[in-house]
């Protein structure tokens, strides 16, 4: 009877085990995360000759080493340094495109304008784009059930710290005229709390960056306002100017036409404003 009780208790404990795992508010690690990262690295190095020296095995292991066995609310930028070292890559001057709250259009643009690069066109950004990941303290397991949410759980989680780390590096290495695409449909066109506003803006190097040119993307077809006069854009201008970097702003009234004109600049309709 006593043995039976122990056995039953063990059975209950076994079935309860998944609930003991730390429950976070965010979605869990993306399915097949290791395979996805490795496959993306292989694919990237195949199509980018300048990165063909990169050892994807070491890249994956450095990525994994940044968060595996670590408490997922205590990740630091230091944890990602081995990965950053392996993924070192430079963008030619005048070819950096930052973005805030308008990722899809920024990526559509660099897919057409192949000589310009967003962070997600670089190896490390490409590896992690749209993925979620986290581990658990003192185990070698990846947590596929839940991961910390930036707002509800903690900001020092594996995903947030990764993007902060690589965004900082991306901004630090930019040179010449840097462009940023901003979403004119949002209440805060420039948001100080976005990755662009809190990390990238402050890590542009005045000795290397001559100017920041903002492209404010309009949402409505009939929207003819000059969104470059928006108070948040003026705030961005002030921050940038104080850092001894010149600031320019352009309204992109018709994003569809804008993309079309990037594809076909000779088109007669592209000679007028977009």
């Amino acid at each position: 009877s006593g043995l039976n009780d122990i056995f039953e208790a063990q059975k209950i404990e076994w079935h309860e085990l998944p609930r003991w795992r730390q429950q976070w508010s965010g979605s869990g690690t993306t399915s097949r995360f290791p395979e996805t990262v490795l496959a993306r690295c292989v694919k990237y190095t195949e199509v980018h000759p300048e990165m063909r020296h990169v050892d994807c095995q070491s890249v994956w292991d450095a990525f994994k080493g940044a968060f595996i066995s670590k408490y997922p609310c205590n990740i630091t930028e230091e944890d990602y340094q081995p990965l950053v070292k392996l993924g070192t890559q430079t963008v030619p001057c005048n070819k950096t495109l930052l973005w805030s709250r308008i990722k899809d259009l920024a990526h559509q643009f660099t897919q057409v304008q192949r000589d310009m690069f967003t962070l997600e066109d670089m190896l490390l950004g490409y590896l992690a784009d749209d993925l979620t990941w986290c581990g658990e303290f003192n185990t070698f397991e990846i947590n596929y059930q839940s991961c910390p949410d930036w707002r509800k759980d903690c900001s020092n989680n594996p995903v947030s710290v990764f993007w902060k780390t690589v965004s900082r590096r991306f901004a630090e290495t930019a040179c010449g005229v840097v462009h940023v695409m901003l979403n004119g449909s949002r209440s805060k066109i420039f948001d100080k709390n976005s990755t662009f506003g809190s990390v990238e803006v402050h890590n542009l190097q005045p000795e290397k960056v001559q100017a920041l040119e903002a492209w404010v993307i309009h949402g409505g077809r009939e929207d003819s306002r000059d969104l470059c006069q928006d108070p948040t854009i003026k705030e961005l201008e002030s921050i940038i100017s104080k850092r001894n970097i010149r600031f320019f702003c352009k309204n992109i009234y018709r994003p569809d036409k804008f993309l079309q004109c990037v594809k076909n600049p000779e088109d007669s309709s592209c000679l007028s404003g977009i």
Epitope: P34, E35, V42, C56, S58, W60, D61, A62
Partner: antibody, heavy 113, light 112 residues
Framework: QSLEESGGRLVTPGTPLTLTCTVS????????MAWVRQAPGKGLEYIGI?????TTYYATWAKGRFIVSKTSTTVDLKITSPTTEDTATYFC??????????WGPGTLVTVSS | DIVMTQTPASVEAAVGGTVTINCQAS??????LAWYQQKPGQRPKLLIY???TLASGVSSRFKGSGSGTEFTLTISDLASADAATYYC??????????FGYGFGGGTEVVVK
């Protein structure tokens, strides 16, 4: 850039043996190194790898039978409990995203009672 | 683990002829495949990497093709020095759940 294996010899079954690969002109912190073996008259087979980051992986058949480790200039392969089936030439190789592009000359291990 | 299936195990051809060796991977390895030539008592020699790129100093008579899971090595204008065993190799990478490194069983090429 070169690799050279050493430590191959005649051992009796069950006697642990460590092979060493000494590298020259190679930064082991950024390259994945592997051990490959070839039994007499047979094909090539992977045993395991150690990445630049230092993580080890093994072919399923090799798990528990071999241990790969490294220092800044050497990559070691420990055969934990050799059997006669482990008689082979053992190669140390460098693997890049392009290929396994650099091979040592190999070292012969003979396991016999 | 990845399984590399190489065919045929042996092939015989005359000098000046052409030999084709096939290699099939059990999973998608993109272009992460190499071909090696090995002669008795020697270490393997790299012929082709990235499925189709000729290694430095290798004759253009050796041609690699394919991607994903199906790959081919073609040796044209066969010479007596080409008599050797040829291996395909995957170097796709490893995770805790898969070991993406492996060799095919080898193909012995006999030149008449």
């Amino acid at each position: 850039q070169s690799l050279e294996e050493s430590g191959g010899r005649l051992v009796t079954p069950g006697t642990p043996l460590t092979l060493t690969c000494t590298v020259s002109g190679i930064d082991l912190s950024i390259y994945t190194m592997a051990w490959v073996r070839q039994a007499p008259g047979k094909g090539l087979e992977y045993i395991g790898i150690i990445s630049g980051y230092g993580t080890t992986y093994y072919a399923t058949w090799a798990k528990g039978r071999f241990i790969v480790s490294k220092t800044s200039t050497t990559v070691d392969l420990k055969i934990t409990s050799p059997t006669t089936e482990d008689t082979a030439t053992y190669f140390c190789v460098r693997t890049t995203v392009q290929s396994t592009d650099l091979w040592g000359p190999g070292t012969l291990v003979t396991v016999s009672s | 683990d990845i399984v590399m299936t190489q065919t045929p195990a042996s092939v015989e051809a005359a000098v000046g002829g052409t030999v084709t060796i096939n290699c099939q991977a059990s999973q998608n390895i993109y272009s992460n495949l190499a071909w090696y030539q090995q002669k008795p008592g020697q270490r393997p020699k790299l012929l082709i990497y990235k499925a189709s790129t000729l290694a430095s100093g290798v004759s253009s008579r050796f041609k690699g093709s394919g991607s994903g899971t199906e790959f081919t090595l073609t040796i044209s204008d066969l010479a007596s020095a080409d008599a050797a065993t040829y291996y395909c190799q995957s170097y796709y990478g490893a995770t805790s759940s898969s070991f993406g490194y492996g060799f095919g069983g080898g193909t012995e090429v006999v030149v008449k």
